[in-house]
């Protein structure tokens, strides 16, 4: 079958490239108990049916037990994300058992062969868990399987095969090829654990989607829409290299799921929140920043168990690096009237001023056309905590819909040089903070002067808490 063009094309080639691997027999899966944060510490290999290594390695039967499951590999050596995740788990849960599932012999294969091996690896993990359950004090409820890429589906198989129910499975950008649209018993699914949470960071609706697009857990979180991750663009990744490959971009976006999870472990004081939404476009419009009825949740390790709904899709924006947290705001701008607008589509820019800090000038992303005499909703986010918002500066520019319209504008201007300027009339801006759920209304500083021309500034000051009229009360919202 033809491979797609673009970044995925080269990776598609990699997926099907034969590899000469000298393996006489297929060895069993190994379970390496990481007894130290030190990456050079060998750890201990657990052996099914042999209790002595459990004692020798200090396996804590009553503590949480994490199983980290890697994915497909082209190198046959553990990538550094695994080292970071082991270290972060040890830092956060000092008494926990951290077990690295080493299935490199079965993963260092053609991608298609590695996929076919996921079932047998899942079965091996399930057998290990069944054996551990025979021990006093060991509880399956304390088991958390963390699978990256192909490893997420291995975790699904393990959860499916084990006698009983695993406490939690976290899927870190579960693999897409050969799993997209598959039957629930042939991929990670909500049935595989008491709580299944998933981070999707490399999904594509065109070409090859390295990560699975469909929701496969109780909650499925799509940072930055689940596709283009900040800091992973060609300029970001290749710009800093003397020589670079497109594979670096793919790796950056796919692996971002792991780093978001690590961030949630080590930056507990800076939790990132995701918000339930039916799709990415609605989220980009800023209409999904509600925390009512479990509609928002922390991401990664701090996610709260939500089993009431299946396949709850959640979205958030992030920074380009750790800590990934940003502060989301919904902005409702009522455009009362256009004046001499022609075919010009306005682009808004806001600067937010708060008690802690001021934002940069932020563009308001237009998902749909700006409606006249209607309330337009936008999503904005800042990397720093601004504190309580005090005022907003608004500007706009006209972006022509086409070269033809631009020419029409120019011709109109040349024929009527004294044509009155284009103006928008905006009297107030309503703001809702995603993180605090607080609603505020900002009114034009000069109520008599609410028209704004391109490039000019309009200032808005906080005029009331909430969005309702003064005689109405606003219900309080409990954050999760």
């Amino acid at each position: 079958s033809p491979t797609p063009f673009g970044p995925e094309g080269q990776l598609a080639d990699e997926l099907h490239k034969p590899k000469a691997i000298q393996t006489e027999v297929k060895p069993s899966v190994r379970f390496n108990l990481r007894t130290s944060k030190d990456p050079e510490h060998e750890g201990c290999y657990l052996s099914l049916g042999h209790s002595q290594p459990l004692e020798d390695c200090g396996f804590n039967m009553t503590a949480k037990t994490f199983f980290i499951i890697h994915g497909w590999t082209m190198s046959g050596i553990f990538e550094n994300w695994l080292h970071k995740l082991v270290s972060a788990l040890h830092t956060r849960e000092k008494d926990a058992n951290v077990v690295v599932v080493d299935w490199l012999p079965l993963a260092h294969q053609l991608y298609t062969d590695a996929v076919n091996n996921t079932r047998v690896v899942g079965h091996s993990i399930a057998r290990m868990l069944d054996w551990l359950q025979e021990k006093d004090d060991f509880s399956l409820g304390n088991v958390h399987l963390i699978g990256y890429s192909l490893g997420a589906h291995v975790a699904g198989y393990a959860g499916n095969f084990v006698k009983g129910t695993v406490g939690r499975i976290t899927g870190l950008d579960p693999a897409g090829p050969m799993f997209e649209g598959a039957d629930i018993h042939k991929r990670l699914s909500p049935d595989d654990a008491d709580f299944v949470d998933v981070l999707h960071t490399y999904t594509r609706s065109f070409g090859l989607s390295i990560g699975i697009q469909m929701p496969v857990g109780h909650i499925d979180i799509y940072p930055n829409g689940g596709d283009f991750q900040p800091g992973c663009g060609l300029n970001d990744v290749l710009g800093s290299m003397a020589y670079g490959t497109i594979t670096e971009v793919v790796k950056c976006e796919h692996e971002r799921a792991v780093h978001l999870f690590v961030d949630s472990l080590v930056n507990q004081d800076k939790p990132s929140f995701a918000f339930q939404c039916t799709d990415s476009n609605r989220f980009k419009k800023g209409i999904c920043l509600s925390c009512r009825k479990n509609r928002c949740n922390s991401i990664g390790y701090n996610a709260k168990k939500m089993r009431n709904k299946r396949n709850s899709k959640m979205y958030l924006k992030t920074r380009a690096g750790m800590p990934f947290r940003v502060y989301h705001y919904q902005m409702k701008i009522h455009v009362f009237s256009y004046k001499n607008m022609g075919e010009i589509e306005p682009t808004f820019y806001v600067t937010l001023y708060g008690t802690n800090a001021d934002s940069q000038t932020l563009p308001l992303e237009i998902v749909e056309r700006i409606e006249q005499n209607a309330t337009n909703t936008f999503l904005v986010y800042t990397e720093e905590d601004l504190g309580d918002l005090l005022k907003i500066q608004l500007t706009w520019e006209g972006a022509s819909q086409s070269w033809y319209n631009l020419w029409k504008e120019l011709r109109s201007y040349l024929s009527q040089p004294h044509n009155p300027g284009r103006e928008l009339n905006i009297r107030r801006i309503r703001v809702k903070s995603g993180e605090t759920q607080r609603k505020l209304t900002f009114c034009a500083e000069d109520p008599e002067n609410t028209s704004i021309s391109p490039g000019r500034e309009l200032w808005f000051r906080k005029c009331r808490d909430g969005w309702r009229m003064k005689n109405e009360t606003s219900p309080t919202v409990e954050l999760p």
Epitope: A20, I21, Q22, T23, E24, P27, R30, N32, P39, E40, E42, Y45, S75, G76, I77, F78, E79, N80, L82, H83, D102, L104, P105, H108, S240, M241, A242, G244
Partner: antibody
Framework: QVQLVQSGAEVKKPGASVKVSCKAS????????IHWVRQAPGQGLEWMGH????????NNNEKFKDRVTMTRDTSISTAYMELSRLRSDDTAVYYC?????????????WGQGTTVTVSS | DIQMTQSPSSLSASVGDRVTITCRAS??????LNWYQQKPGKAPKLLIS???KLHSGVPSRFSGSGSGTDFTLTISSLQPEDFATYYC?????????FGQGTKLEIK
């Protein structure tokens, strides 16, 4: 204590092949990866590739493409590196080195080196 | 491939001197930087891993620092046995690459 002992010096003609061995002791052979690094006379160090002795999976530096073959024999805790189609610029000291299970792990123990001279 | 550039290529110093060798990577290597010492006719020896972690048996006069793309190896008070060639190596991305080396000679 950890030790990596390599085979003796070799003199080869251009176009021939050379096979260098590296015997490990003092640790569990299958718990670490074995890497091959070479050093041309008066030059720096160049990574050639590695083998995971646990199952024999290898990964080579693209520079050596199909010329390098790495194998191992777990029964005698020995890793091998064969370089084919030798050229005069392959004259170098070839080292095996032990590395932990991560990319980031350092080469913590090295063999004494095997001098390979390619000359007609 | 990630390029590792060491400076200086060579330097002369006296016993008791404080010496600094720098290593620059062509991209961020997430602190996955190791330092080795090599004496003529011998195999390299690990000094420091993960930017600053001293390998067992290595004297405390050796120290490492840095982040992102710029790293430093410091010898606080040179001893006669420290005259050798020093190499940095990145462990962030395959293929693993080394600096070209810094030869430390007696003044």
């Amino acid at each position: 204590q950890v030790q990596l002992v390599q085979s003796g010096a070799e003199v080869k003609k251009p176009g021939a092949s050379v096979k260098v061995s590296c015997k490990a002791s003092g640790y569990t052979f299958t718990d670490n990866t074995i890497h091959w690094v070479r050093q041309a006379p008066g030059q720096g160090l160049e990574w050639m590739g590695h083998i995971n002795p646990y199952y024999g999976g290898t990964n080579n530096n693209e520079k050596f493409k199909d010329r390098v073959t790495m194998t191992r024999d777990t029964s005698i805790s020995t890793a091998y590196m064969e370089l084919s189609r030798l050229r005069s610029d392959d004259t170098a000291v070839y080292y095996c080195a032990r590395k932990g299970i991560y990319y980031s792990s350092p080469f913590d123990y090295w063999g004494q080196g095997t001098t390979v001279t390619v000359s007609s | 491939d990630i390029q590792m550039t060491q400076s200086p290529s060579s330097l002369s110093a006296s016993v008791g001197d404080r010496v600094t060798i720098t290593c620059r990577a062509s991209q961020d290597i997430n602190n996955y930087l190791n330092w080795y010492q090599q004496k003529p006719g011998k195999a390299p020896k690990l000094l420091i891993s993960y930017t600053s972690k001293l390998h067992s048996g290595v004297p405390s006069r050796f120290s490492g620092s840095g982040s992102g793309t710029d790293f430093t190896l410091t010898i606080s008070s040179l001893q006669p046995e420290d005259f050798a060639t020093y190499y940095c190596q990145q462990g962030n991305t395959l293929p693993f690459t080394f600096g070209q080396g810094t030869k430390l000679e007696i003044k």
